[in-house]
Structure formats: C-alpha cells, structure tokens
C-alpha cells in the first residue's frame, strides 16, 4: 500500500525531491534517481530491459566512486577487476585473475608466482638456512667414551621457507661417523654386562638375516673393535676423519 | 608503459594564446578522464581543467574559466587545452595527467612563460 | 575551495632519520587524500591514496594516516632517494587541491 501511494506520488511530481526515495534528490517514476542528494553516488542498476537510477552511500563491487562537480557518480571498474580505486588501480580480481600492480592478470610475469589463496602475483621466495651449528660430541649410544667408533651430528636451522616456486631446503641434519674419545668409561658410564648383550636366538619364522637389535650390534662390532692393536686404531681413525656420512632433512 | 608527451608551450606575450597539445600512448585513451595541472616557476601544483572520457563534459578552475578550453580527440589519442587572454600569473609549467580522482600518469611538462 | 595545508613549508634531515609532514583540510574531506612525490624538474609521482593505500613499487617505508581534516605523510626511515618535495591531494571536492608543499632536503 504505501509503496503504491509512493509511486503515485512521484507521477503526479515526476521531478520533486519530496516524492523520490532514499537519498533521490530528483527523480521520475520510470527512470528512478535522476539526482543524488549531497555526497552519495548515482548508479544505474538494470531491472529487466530498463535501467533505474539509485543513490547509494557506497557504489557496489565492481565499481568505484568519483566526485564531480554536477555529479557523484559510480564508474565501472575494469572488466577483470572486482573492487578498485579507480580504472588504474584494482585492488581485488576477479575469480581465475591474479593481482599484480593494480592490474589483473591470467598468468603472473616471469620472476613471480601466484598466490592461490590472496590470489595475487607475489615474488617467489627461495629456501635460505642458517651456518651450520658445531658439530655434537662424538658418541657412541649416548657415549662419549670408549674406543668405539661413534657418530656426530650438526644441524641449521630454515631461516626462510621456500614459496611453491621457490629453491627446496638443503639438508638440514648431518651426521658423520668418528672415533670416541681415547678414554676410559667411568664405572656408570660402562655398557650393560657382556650376558645381557648376548645375542637373541630369532624368533619361530623370523629371518636369520632379520635386521639385530641395537644392543646386539654393539656386541657384534665390540669384539673385532677389541682386538685392534694401536696402530690400526690410528690408521682407521684417519679414515673416519675422511669419511662424512650426511642424514639429510629435506624440507 | 603509459607515455604523455606535451608539446606546444613557449613565451607569449599577456593577451596572445597558445594552444598545448599531449599525445598518450601505451593505456586505452578514450576510457580515461584526462586533465592539465600547473605549476608555477618555484610554487605547488594547481588544477586547471579536466575532461571526462568521452569529451560530453568539462571543468575549470575559476581563474581560466572562459579562458581556457579543454578538449580531446579519441582517435588521435590526443588531449588539448586552448589558452586564450593569456596573463603573466598563468606562467607555469603545465602538466597532462589521467584524472581519475588522483593524478595517476603525468607528462614530462611544457613550460609556458607570459611576458611581455 | 577545500584549501590544504601542509606543514613545515620544509624540513632538513639526515638518512634513517623518522620524518612526518601533515596535511590539514580547511573541511572534512573524509579518507580522499593522496600524497605525491616530486623531484627537481621531474613531474610529480603518486605514493599513497586513500589516505593510508600505497601504490604498488612505493617502499614501505612510506605510510599515511590521518581521517577527516588531519592527514600525515610518514617516512619510517629517510633513504637518499628521499629526498624531494611531496605534496598532499584531496579529491573529495572539486576542485580538486594540493597543499603547498613540503621540501625534504639533507641535513
């Protein structure tokens, strides 16, 4: 009822404010908003085959307000273009369009990859990792004394992570085989007693072949370790210097 | 890449006129609102004249209106300004930019020097 | 008019030095304010609209804020490319003004 009222009112007065609604400042019942009242927009939005003047606060997605001196009016962003400033600067795409300097575009230039989730072209940013740290002491199942032959470590830490794009990670674990301290285990720094150490007979069915436990691989390697005389000790720690097993992290 | 070249400026004496020309290339020229700014030897930036898109509307400062008249020809890619009862405050350097609420692309300048 | 001011007229200062120039509007013009730098006998190059929204290839280092009548240009740490003459821009009214600049120079 009082929406006909209105309409009737504005065919009587086709181009006074009293009869327009919303921020219409004139108007005419078929074309809608003629004219804006002060500081908002005019636009024209398309109801079926006709166009209709309205005035908004704010223009819509997709367009973008400009002040003139006769008018407020909404214009068009760029067709790949969702939100923007004006028709230089976009500043949201549309969907399947990348941002990349206020312009969309469908691919990202060389140099640049897109960003799926801001869906912008961004710099591709490779892998970049610390010095490596000292190495660990030399230890052998958490010994550092002994003459066994043992391991050390050293590690780096990512310092950047690497874009999809981007350079992947170096290792970031390294271990190397060394000789233990030339010294002798404390009484509570000694192993388990040699019976412990013995090894296990294989279960029904498992492999004589099966990978040992840790414990009997110590007792394993013990023994030929044991007998060495110095000068071999010597010659074999050279070697180990020589020899750098890396354990790589791959990030 | 976006170019404005301006052309068309020199000494006149106070009275005479002088028509600036600005040839755009590297944007699509009939989508833009382009204007002149100016700007006094040593001084800021002043608005002169602005010209929609399509040429259908224009505006002026109040010191060149009736004076000056912009103008564009979208097949030529090439905006205007007509300059006429030229004055010594209207020495300056002038400047054709895109007009789309900022300023965003600006010519290299033409100088303009009123002197009698 | 919307008349724009801007303040100091000029200013010295050192590289790494914080710099801050405002702008101040004779009315409310809202968050319509860009800012423009110019070098010698170069034509002027738009740094910031929106007041606060950097166009893309402007250092970080710049920034703006401000809303209604006070605005303010802020250079976080001053490089030799620096140093110039900038400008504020309201385009909430025609005409559309600039302020009379300010001219950053080496110390």
């Known amino acids: 009822q009082n929406a006909s009222r209105g309409r009737r009112q504005r065919r009587m007065h086709p181009n006074v404010s009293q009869g327009c609604q919303g921020g219409c400042a004139t108007c005419s019942d078929y074309n809608g908003c003629l004219s804006c009242k002060p500081r908002l927009f005019f636009a024209l939005e398309r109801i079926g085959m006709k166009q209709i003047g309205v005035c908004l606060s704010s223009c819509p997605s997709g367009y973008y307000g400009t002040r003139y001196p006769d008018i407020n009016k909404c214009t068009k962003c760029k067709a790949d273009c969702d939100t923007c400033f004006n028709k230089n600067f976009c500043t949201k795409c549309k969907s399947g369009f990348y941002l990349h300097l206020g312009k969309c575009l469908d691919n990202c230039p060389e140099g640049l990859e897109a960003n799926n989730h801001t869906m912008e072209c961004v710099s591709i940013v490779h892998c970049e990792v610390s010095e490596w740290n000292p190495w660990s002491p030399c230890t052998k199942k958490g010994k550092t004394c002994g003459f066994k032959r043992g391991t050390e470590t050293r590690v780096r830490e990512i310092i950047q992570h690497p874009s999809a794009k981007g350079n992947l990670c170096p290792p970031t674990n390294e271990t190397r085989k060394c000789t233990v301290q030339r010294k002798k285990c404390q009484k509570g720094e000694r192993g388990k007693k040699g019976r412990e150490r013995k090894r296990k007979k294989p279960n029904k069915g498992e492999s004589k072949e099966a990978i040992p436990d840790s414990k009997s691989l110590e007792s394993s390697k013990e023994i030929p370790e044991q007998r060495e005389n110095k000068q071999q000790q010597k010659k074999r720690k050279v070697q180990d210097k020589q020899k750098s097993v890396s354990v790589s992290t791959v990030h | 890449e976006v170019q404005l070249v301006e052309s068309g400026g020199g000494v006149v004496q106070p009275g005479r006129s002088l028509r600036l020309s600005c040839a755009a290339s590297?944007?699509?020229?009939?989508?833009?609102?382009m204007a002149w700014v100016r700007q006094a030897p040593g001084k800021g930036l002043e608005w002169v004249a602005t010209?929609?898109?399509?040429?259908?509307?224009?505006y002026y400062r109040d010191s060149v209106k009736g004076r000056f008249t912009i103008s564009r020809d979208n097949s030529k890619n090439t905006l205007y300004l007509q300059m006429n009862s030229l004055r010594a405050e209207d020495t300056a350097v002038y400047y054709c930019?895109?007009?789309?609420?900022?300023?965003?692309?600006w010519g290299q300048g033409t100088m303009v020097t009123v002197s009698s | 008019d919307i008349q724009l001011t801007q303040s100091p007229s000029s200013l010295s200062a050192s590289v790494g030095d914080r710099v801050t120039i405002t702008c101040r509007a004779s009315e409310d013009i809202y968050s319509d304010l860009a800012w423009y730098q110019q070098k010698p006998g170069k034509s002027p190059k738009l740094l910031i609209y929106?007041?606060?929204s950097l166009i893309h290839g402007v250092p970080s280092r710049f920034s703006g804020s401000g809303s209604g009548t006070d605005f303010t240009l802020t250079i976080s740490s001053l490089q030799p490319e620096d140093f110039a003459t900038y400008f504020c821009q309201q385009y909430d009214n025609y005409p559309n003004t600039f302020g009379q600049g300010t001219k950053l120079e080496i110390k």
């Open positions: 590297g944007f699509t020229f009939s989508d833009y609102d």
């Open positions: 929106d007041v606060n």
């Open positions: 010209i929609i898109y399509d040429g259908s509307r224009t």
């Open positions: 930019a895109t007009h789309d609420k900022t300023f965003d692309y």
